[in-house]
């Protein structure tokens, strides 16, 4: 049985302030079951950016329909980017549990924010 992979194809993305940023992430398998979450930064102080399971993330929308049972694309779009959004974003697969257990992280995508053209 092949090991599940979390694929973040872009190492870096550059976006102008005020625009939207698309952060791509796909998984190689839907099993084992468990949620995908997006974080900015790594380690214990990382910031939760998006979690399909629960929570309200008004600036974040999934690129693909996450309610499709065969969905393997967990890319997100973040609107109205500001310099404060700069950082490295990680797509993380969890295995179900109490609590859910981190299984594998993508390599990360560094988001840089350019000044808005005048």
């Amino acid at each position: 049985e092949e090991e599940l992979q979390v694929i973040q194809p872009e190492k870096s993305v550059s976006v102008a302030a005020g625009d939207s940023a698309t952060l791509n992430c796909t998984v190689s398998s839907l099993i084992p079951v468990g949620p995908i979450q997006w974080f900015r930064g790594a380690g214990p102080g990382r910031e939760l950016i998006y979690n399909l399971k629960e929570g309200h993330f008004p600036r974040v929308t999934p690129v693909s329909d996450p309610t499709k049972r065969n969905n393997m694309d967990f890319s997100i779009r973040i609107s109205n980017i500001t310099p404060a959004d700069a950082g490295t974003y990680y797509c993380v697969k969890f295995r179900k549990g109490s609590p859910d257990v981190e299984l594998k992280s993508g390599a990360g995508t560094e988001l840089s924010v350019r000044a808005k053209p005048s």
Epitope: P32, P66, T67, K68, R69, K96
Partner: antibody
């Protein structure tokens, strides 16, 4: 308050057709996957169809595949189940149910009775 | 026939603890839920995602999982808990929603 109200049940002859409706309110219908679950008299629950939030992807068990079609109109907040080539064993109360992020059911309608009899 | 297996009946005295088990699904590809149904009524969701309880459900209802078996525990059973209880699942390997055959809980 989440509300799901089914309609369209009735008596139909074997080989006949029927379309059930489920009117949804109290939540963002277009963001949730939905399903139909039935219960034959004195029997247990049986899932018969599921549909993604956008309506592009549908799912069925072998028992109804090719005879039942689930669809939705997000502009009307309504879920449908088109049932063709009905058989006596399709006699049941049909419930519509809202799906959670991982395709379990959190809210149920009150059900509508379908009787297939000559 | 039902893909998930649960006992047809369980009896318990008021105030005691009732446990209903459900098995048959692969741990790695299944999520489980528990539904309560009283005669002539629609099902009500008691537990989802194996052990999560909706906010409107009393704390005496809890879910747990161990390997391929999940358990619904009702602590301090009350007369109003007499009902049919269904184990339901989502199977990611087949994109289907199997159910157990139901367990009739009798409060003695």
């Amino acid at each position: 308050e989440v509300q799901l109200v089914e309609s369209g049940g009735g008596v139909v002859q074997p080989g006949g057709s029927l379309r059930l409706s489920c009117a949804a309110s109290g939540f963002t219908f277009s963001s949730n996957a939905m399903s139909w679950v039935r219960q034959a008299p004195g029997k247990g629950l049986e899932w018969v169809a599921g549909i993604s939030a956008g309506g592009s992807d549908t799912y069925y068990p072998a028992s109804v595949k090719g005879r039942f079609t689930i669809s939705r109109d997000n502009s009307k907040n309504t879920l449908y189940l088109q049932m063709n080539s009905l058989r006596a064993e399709d006699t049941a109360v049909y419930y519509c149910a809202r799906e959670t992020w991982n395709h379990l059911f959190d809210y149920w309608g009150q059900g509508t009775l379908v009787t297939v009899s000559s | 026939s039902y893909e998930l297996t649960q006992p047809p009946s369980v009896s318990v005295s008021p105030g005691q603890t009732a446990r209903i088990t459900c098995s048959g699904g692969s741990y790695s590809s299944y999520y489980y839920a528990w539904y309560q149904q009283k005669p002539g009524q629609a099902p009500v969701t008691l537990i989802y995602s194996d052990d999560k309880r909706p906010s409107n459900i009393p704390e005496r209802f809890s879910g747990s999982s161990s390997g391929t078996t999940v358990t619904l525990t009702i602590s301090g059973v009350q007369a109003e808990d007499e009902a049919d209880y269904y184990c339901g699942g989502y199977d990611q390997s087949s994109y289907t929603n199997p159910f157990g055959g139901g367990t009739k809980l009798t409060v003695l």
